[in-house]
């Protein structure tokens, strides 16, 4: 009886296409299939950045994958070949692992890489990122920001860069088509006369990093003589009501604070014949019905109803 | 098996020269900076330059006037040219592989002697 | 430059004992580029632990490292004979890269 084998696959390689993360694995069948004409073989793949505790696995029929990598770090994957039950009259049959890795190859110290990147998506509209020159760099370092998203043919450089000294510290995006919902990726690299710059990677949803407009248009209503209901209007732009949460600061008297989260343009305060004055702001920001994190906007002018009857006026900014 | 192999060293007379090399074996010269570092008799270790996988340069800076770091990719090889010795200079040179932002291999190192 | 300072700078221990190392750092060092080496006399130094906790290929589970910011700290949790060696802090964070004046461990 005698013990079935298969070989692993070959030419197996990570290719990096020049889209600052994303990656392709590929490999080539395994020699000597021709036994297992009838077979569907499959192959069990798995990776991971060097240093991350898991393994990622996928099992194709498929001779290539794609996904995102950290760049900053090095990449490692292992495949093999799995014959299933149905091709070997029992059990399934594994092949040896077929291993590779890919790194990008750095040049310069790492204090030389730029310092606190932030991004931030206004109002889901308008991209901006920011940094600060690595440390112990001179002026004459130039940093230099590129970024890609599926559907763009190839990475494409900023075109519109923030100046401070004449150096690149930021960078404003131009408008960027259908580019949420997926990863988006950065790299900021840099050239000098004086030493070689270390190149960072950046990857992020344009979602979780929406920062919106503050609401507008707050108002005060009288429910009753113990209710007052605050209104306010979402900001105009392209995000709907829907992915909103709101934060309210409401201030009574100068004295109590009120601090409450809500998902919808109003909320309703209970309130004493006495309240002589009342203040409130809001903030939003998007929810997790719409990403998985986000920035509160600023917060909303403040609207202040003093020394009136509300239930004759409704105040309105 | 990685391999690195340093060579050049010897007595030399203050304000002389010198150039080390270093031979790469057993991966990918291309894919990897690499560093020279020294260590003088008794003392510890001092980074001196590292050549980048790309060609580019960093030295320590009390150092860079009077040593250039230089790579023969055809030839898996590095080389340290050391000019205007000082007695202070006298010392083993590694070479080292640079693997992560790491020191992965080094030489057995080569010893420089100055002095009249 | 950054300056790191070992203490103790040598230090006499007896097999199976556990042994502590520090590193100190004049400024802040990431984590991730902070390595310890050893060197046996006459022999070139060789990656003991990398990114201050992670051991090196081949380096026995009985090292350990820990630390961030400015203090950093190397174990060796039952001193082996093969041990009797000195060990460098280092940090390849800021050029010039720099290591530790070394902490020499002899025999008792």
């Known amino acids: 009886d005698t013990e079935i084998k298969v070989n692993p696959p070959q030419d197996f390689e990570i290719v990096d296409p020049g889209y600052l993360g994303y990656l392709y694995l590929q490999w080539q069948p395994p020699l000597s299939l021709d036994h297992f004409k009838e077979c569907t073989v499959e192959y069990e793949l798995k990776y991971r950045n060097i240093g991350s505790e898991t393994w990622k696995t996928i099992i194709t029929k498929n001779l290539h994958y794609k996904d995102g990598f950290d760049l900053n770090k090095g990449i490692e994957a292992k495949i093999h070949t799995l014959l299933p039950w149905q091709c070997t009259n029992g059990s399934e049959v594994q092949s040896s692992w077929a291993e590779t890795t890919y790194w990008i190859s750095p040049q310069g110290i790492p204090e030389t890489k730029v310092q606190d990147m932030d991004c931030v998506y206004y109002n889901w509209q308008y991209l901006l990122c920011s940094w600060k020159p690595g440390i112990g760099v001179l002026l004459d370092t130039n940093y230099n920001l590129f970024y890609w998203y599926e559907g763009l043919d190839h990475a494409l450089q900023c075109v519109d860069y923030i100046k401070a000294d004449g150096q690149n510290i930021g960078c404003r995006f131009p408008y960027l088509e259908a580019s949420d919902y997926k990863d988006f990726y950065i790299c900021v690299n840099g050239s000098s006369e004086n030493k070689p710059i270390r190149s960072s990677y950046f990857t992020f949803q344009l979602q979780n990093i929406v920062k919106p407009l503050p609401p507008v248009y707050l108002t005060f209503t009288r429910e009753s003589s113990c209710e007052i209901k605050l209104k306010w209007s979402i900001p105009l732009g392209p995000i709907p009501a829907r992915c909103f949460d709101y934060e309210i600061e409401i201030r009574e008297d100068d004295t109590t604070l009120v601090t409450a989260t809500v998902e919808n343009e109003t909320y309703t305060l209970k309130t004493t014949n006495e309240t002589r004055q009342l203040c409130f702001v809001v903030r939003s920001k998007v929810n997790i019905y719409c990403s998985d994190d986000g920035i509160w906007s600023e917060w909303s002018d403040k609207q202040c109803w003093e020394g009136e009857d509300l239930s004759k006026k409704t105040l309105l900014r | 098996e990685v391999q690195l192999v340093e060579s050049g060293g010897g007595l030399v007379q203050p304000g002389g020269s010198l150039r080390l090399s270093c031979a790469a074996s057993g991966f990918t010269f291309t894919k990897y900076g690499v560093h020279w570092v020294r260590q003088a008799p008794g003392k510890g270790l001092e980074w001196v330059a590292v050549k980048w996988a790309g060609g580019s340069t960093d030295y320590n800076s009390a150092l860079m006037s009077r040593f250039t770091i230089s790579r023969d990719n055809a030839k898996n090889s590095l080389y340290l040219q050391m000019n205007s010795l000082r007695a202070e200079d006298t010392a083993v040179y590694y070479c080292?592989?640079?693997?992560?932002?790491?020191?992965?291999?080094w030489g057995q190192g080569t010893l420089v002697t100055v002095s009249s | 430059d950054i300056q790191m300072t070992q203490s103790p700078s040598s230090l006499s221990a007896s097999v199976g004992d556990r042994v502590t190392i520090t590193c100190t750092a004049s400024l802040s060092v990431s984590s991730t580029y902070l390595h310890w080496y050893q060197q046996k006399p006459g022999k070139a130094p060789k990656l003991l632990i990398y990114?201050?906790?992670n051991l090196a290929s081949g380096v026995p589970s009985r090292f350990s490292g820990s630390g961030s910011g400015t203090d950093f700290t190397l174990t060796i949790s039952s001193l082996q004979p093969e041990d009797f060696a000195t060990y460098y802090c280092?940090?390849?964070?800021?050029?010039?890269?720099?290591f530790g004046g070394g902490t020499k461990v002899e025999i008792k």
């Open positions: 990114s201050t906790s």
């Open positions: 080292a592989r640079d693997h992560r932002d790491a020191m992965d291999y």
């Open positions: 280092h940090q390849y964070h800021r050029s010039p890269l720099t």
